[in-house]
Interface confidence: low
């Protein structure tokens, strides 16, 4: 069937349109185009005779039409009047006629629109504003944008006049925005420049800052007033109803009790004609006395005595506050406050309760602090410590031992050897010792104020032979690239040299290896798997030497990035797929597989028999080391070709 297609259907003025003919019959004599929906000689545009290839213009020909041998008609430089129907009249060689009708619509290219407004300075909650999109254009659609967004749904927004007019009822300050209108027709769209709506509002109720209403005599009063307003508000201050000044800030230096009263800020907006006021009541106080602390026990004994601290002077209707170590009181069952908070009781004091303690008196305005008080808590003695820590000595050297025990007041010391009292000093000195000086050395510490005593016993061995050393470690299973390990050679002996060997060799030079504590401690920073070796320490003096048994470091590492073998990525259908995954790790990792993201078995080897092209995809091996808490994975693409075809490379191969 003969049909006409208009390309395009909607045509812009000045552009062109092609009336394209489909299913044109064979064996034609000629054809003719007419304006309208029927054949009318008065409205003929152009005729065409195939035999002569001659085109003949008709009464409706405008000089803008071109007819093609395939009967299609091109109309150029389209005008509004071209809108409508077009009829093609086809005359076949057997003089049988056939007709078809097509149509198109013509629209103007739209000009850039602009926005007109009926009110350039509307007042909040009072005025309405009507925006109109100019010019008025036939067959055009009007759209509106607020801050480059489509119109929000609001009962205060109304479109009228075919959406050409946007009315905002009862404008608010939030309507201050960028407004644009847009005109559209089927062939063009244009957007206006933005119009900013300037809404007059306020003043809102002013706020007076700062908020505090209580001041001390002698301070400066500096009040500031602010009210949201457009245009900005004008401010006035009144004190007890009397006008003071027309400024936003009110400053009164060196105030007295007489400056107490009501302070009013008035905000005025000259454009809206509105006034708003806020009142604050200011109270000025005279200075209170400085507090001080008294105590019922100046030298309490640890774990025995209680102490009551009292804040003086006693003032009626006053709030008392306490601080310990410059912090508010901690929650503790050993701390108790009296009903009026004036007395703080410490039950069963400890050495940590020394303070300092402060109390404060709070008036309506501020807090006055006392001077700090420190408690002299009597404690100790604790278990004494004997230094140095050596237990082995060579004959002929001097033995010098020192004793210390935490105590208040400081402890008095006594030394005993094998239970026999030696001297009442903090230090014990014996020159040129022999094997006979081996024995039990006891330090006794005594606190004369509390009457308590404590002792510590140390075994001293005097011998020419050094004992066999041993290695202690602070970390038996360090994690690679994370942990450090400190080996210590035991025991600690006087005038002794400490040596280290790794795998039977002396220590390599490395910034990760550090000797300390007189070479007695060997620290390995940021251990690696290569540090998993045998470590031996040795001790020697001028007459003997000895070595420890080896200690092997067990370094946890990995898992490293796994390797999937074999490396092939292309397989023939029917083959067996046998993928093995390996990752360096200590301890051995756990393995799992995923095919195309779907979890499979938790094994090191993935086996699929007689694969088909359905087995194409990504094969991922995941490894995890529970000891190091680390994971790793690798992905491999597998392509399976049907038997008999040459397997190509897969994507990602």
């Amino acid at each position: 069937k003969l049909t006409i297609e208009s390309t395009p259907f909607n045509v812009a003025e000045g552009k062109e349109v092609l009336l394209l003919v489909h299913n044109l019959p064979q064996h034609l004599f000629g054809y003719s185009w007419y304006k309208g929906e029927r054949v009318d000689g008065n409205r003929q545009i152009i005729g065409y005779v195939i035999g002569t290839q001659q085109a003949t213009p008709g009464p409706a020909y405008s000089g803008r039409e071109i007819i093609y041998p395939n009967a299609s008609l091109l109309i150029q430089n389209i005008i509004q009047n071209d809108t409508g129907f077009y009829t093609l009249h086809v005359i076949k060689s057997d003089l049988v006629n056939e007709e078809a009708t097509g149509q198109f619509r013509v629209y103007p290219e739209l000009p850039k629109p602009s926005i007109s407004s009926n009110n350039s300075k509307p007042v909040e909650d009072k005025d309405a504003v009507a925006f109109t999109c100019e010019p008025e254009t036939q067959d055009a659609t009007y759209l509106w944008w607020v801050n480059n967004q489509s119109l929000p749904v609001s009962p205060r927004l109304q479109l009228s006049n075919g959406n050409r007019t946007l009315t905002l009822f009862n404008v608010t300050r939030n309507d201050t925005a960028s407004y644009k209108c847009e005109t559209q027709n089927p062939v063009s769209a244009r957007r206006s420049d933005s119009v900013i709506l300037n809404v007059l509002y306020g003043p809102d109720a002013p706020t007076i800052s700062p908020l505090n209403t209580s001041y001390r005599s002698g301070e400066n009063l500096n009040l500031s007033c602010h009210a949201a307003s457009n245009p900005p508000a004008q401010y006035s201050w009144f004190v007890n109803g009397t006008f003071q000044q027309s400024t936003q800030e009110l400053f009164i230096p060196n105030i007295t009790v007489n400056n107490s009263g009501s302070y009013t800020c008035q905000a005025h907006n000259s454009d809206t004609g509105l006034n708003r006021t806020t009142v604050t009541t200011i109270t000025v106080y005279a200075e209170p006395p400085k507090p001080f602390i008294t105590s019922n026990n100046s030298n309490p004994v640890e774990d025995e005595d209680a102490v009551a601290l009292t804040c003086e002077p006693e003032i009626q209707n006053t709030t008392y506050l306490w601080w310990v170590n410059n912090q508010s009181l901690p929650v503790s069952p050993r701390l108790q406050l009296s009903n009026d908070n004036r007395t703080l009781t410490l039950l069963s004091v400890t050495r940590n309760d020394v303070g300092p303690y402060e109390c404060g008196i709070q008036n309506e305005l501020s807090v006055d602090h006392s001077d700090p008080v420190i408690l002299n808590v009597l404690y100790g003695p604790d278990d004494p410590t004997i230094s140095p820590s050596y237990t082995y000595y060579r004959p002929g050297v001097n033995l010098s031992l020192s004793c210390h025990a935490a105590s208040n007041p400081p402890a008095q010391y006594s030394w005993l050897i094998d239970g026999n009292i030696q001297q009442h000093t903090q230090e014990l000195f014996i020159s040129n010792i022999t094997e006979k000086n081996s024995g039990l050395y006891t330090c006794q510490a005594n606190n004369s104020a509390s009457g308590h005593s404590r002792t510590t016993v140390k075994t001293i061995t005097v011998s020419a032979e050094l004992p066999k050393p041993s290695i202690s470690s602070n970390n038996s299973k360090p994690v690679e690239d994370k942990d450090a390990v400190a080996f210590t050679c035991e025991p600690e002996a006087q005038n002794t040299t400490y040596l280290w060997w790794v795998n039977g060799q002396s220590l390599p030079v490395s910034p990760r290896l550090q000797l300390s504590n007189g070479n007695r401690t060997l620290t390995l920073f940021n251990v690696t798997r290569n540090d998993a070796r045998a470590y031996v320490c040795g001790i020697q003096n001028s007459v003997s030497a000895n070595r420890s048994d080896p200690v092997t470091l067990d370094v946890l590492y990995g898992p490293d990035t796994p390797i999937i073998s074999p490396p092939d990525s292309s397989y023939l259908s029917g083959a067996n797929l046998n993928l093995s995954c390996h990752s360096a790790s200590n301890p051995s990792p756990q393995y799992s597989w995923r095919i195309n993201g779907i979890p499979q078995q938790h094994t090191q080897v993935l086996f699929i028999a007689k694969i088909t092209p359905n087995n194409n995809g990504t094969y991922a091996c995941f490894v995890s080391n529970l000891a190091t808490g680390r994971n790793n994975s690798i992905v491999k693409s597998i392509t399976v070709s049907a038997s008999g075809t040459s397997p190509g490379l897969s994507a990602g191969a």
Epitope: N596, T618, V635, K636, S637, A651, G652, A653
Partner: nanobody
Framework: EVQLVESGGGLVQPGGSLRLSCAAS????????IGWVRRAPGKEEELVAN????????RYADSVKGRFTISADTSKNTAYLQMNSLRAEDTAVYYC????????????WGQGTTVTVSS
């Protein structure tokens, strides 16, 4: 914070070349797949190319095959789109995006760089 910053767009004549860069921060591009998405007025959004640096997988839309090449430098954490034999229909805003390896769905993209092909 995950960020993708595109650069390299501009005006070029038909048949010319451009190289777009996508600098990633806040994540490692070898842990995911990166794609280039283009948007042109009146046309459907199109994923023109994507790459999964971890295993070297690449994919191209039919409209750019043989003309565009996607690559990645994991040491610089940057993806590239080399565009040769540019045509007028390649005019668009090009966005760098994080792309799902499985279904090529993209859920995060940068601010875009404009490519205009015109004589």
């Amino acid at each position: 914070e995950v960020q993708l910053v595109e650069s390299g767009g501009g005006l070029v004549q038909p048949g010319g070349s451009l190289r777009l860069s996508c600098a990633a921060s806040g994540f490692n591009i070898k842990d995911t797949c990166i794609g280039w998405v283009r948007r042109a007025p009146g046309k459907e959004e199109e994923l023109v190319a994507n790459i999964c640096p971890y295993h070297g997988y690449t994919r191209y839309a039919d409209s750019v095959k043989g003309r565009f090449t996607i690559s990645a430098d994991t040491s610089k954490n940057t993806a590239y789109l080399q565009m040769n034999s540019l045509r007028a229909e390649d005019t668009a805003v090009y966005y760098c995006a994080i792309v799902s390896y499985v279904d090529e769905y993209y859920n995060y993209w940068g601010q875009g760089t404009t490519v205009t092909v015109s004589s």
